[in-house]
Interface confidence: medium
Amino acid sequence: NKILVKQSPMLVAYDNAVNLSCKYSYNLFSREFRASLHKGLDSAVEVCVVYGNYSQQLQVYSKTGFNCDGKLGNESVTFYLQNLYVNQTDIYFCKIEVMYPPPYLDNEKSNGTIIHVKGKHLCPSPLFPGPSKP
């Protein structure tokens, strides 16, 4: 009995920022849950975590250096990623687990979202660029 997740197939981050909405076939209201966003085909990098507990404030954090925020809807979590680098263009997967009330639930693997980062390169440009080659 798995939760189904829907994501946009592709998003373009024009200004190094993007909103990725994860829509679930499950109502998160009054649940203890952990929603996370993972980078790469193997989901090796946990980009951002949104932890919700019916008795506490929503916790949003990244242990991998991403600048992220999260917003909770009844059946969705939206991850807001900022300061993305062009080389962070990749496929991103939404995951969810519900710990309370029982039974423990998690999701079927989603199709993922390709985030294409087209923004500025976020690296300092030289003040005095060298002479251009003819």
Epitope: R34, Y51, E97, M99, Y100, P102, Y104, D106
Partner: nanobody, 118 residues
Framework: VQLVESGGGLVQPGGSLRLSCAAS????????IGWVRRAPGKEEELVAR????????RYADSVKGRFTISADTSKNTAYLQMNSLRAEDTAVYYC????????????WGQGTTVTVSS
């Protein structure tokens, strides 16, 4: 379904113990595993809990920073590392599958006794 605890014993205050909970008949990554302790004259306490494939954890305030719960899904075993033990940690520690806060559980182990005394 079976849960078998081990690792209890007598330890001096400030010492450490590591409890193990070997599960069979179900996959621990498909549920939550909790460590519950019972001591005479005290309320039963869910001291730590770990859930699912991603290993989300939660601790009772009384053990935060001292106890660490973990799981090895390849061995289908959960662990409770107990450091800086105190006399008040003396209890029978039970491993329970799918804790339903705070006092009802689906499956229980037989318990292992932890005694903290000099």
């Amino acid at each position: 379904v079976q849960l078998v605890e081990s690792g209890g014993g007598l330890v001096q205050p400030g010492g450490s113990l590591r409890l193990s909970c070997a599960a069979s008949g179900f996959n621990i990554k498909d549920t939550c595993i909790g460590w519950v302790r019972r001591a005479p004259g005290k309320e039963e306490e869910l001291v730590a809990r770990i859930c699912g494939e991603y290993g989300s954890t939660r601790y009772a305030d009384s053990v935060k920073g001292r106890f660490t719960i973990s799981a090895d899904t390849s061995k289908n075993t959960a662990y409770l590392q107990m450091n800086s033990l105190r006399a008040e940690d003396t209890a029978v520690y039970y491993c329970a599958a799918q804790p339903r806060y705070y006092d009802v559980y689906d499956y229980w182990g037989q318990g292992t006794t932890v005694t903290v005394s000099s």
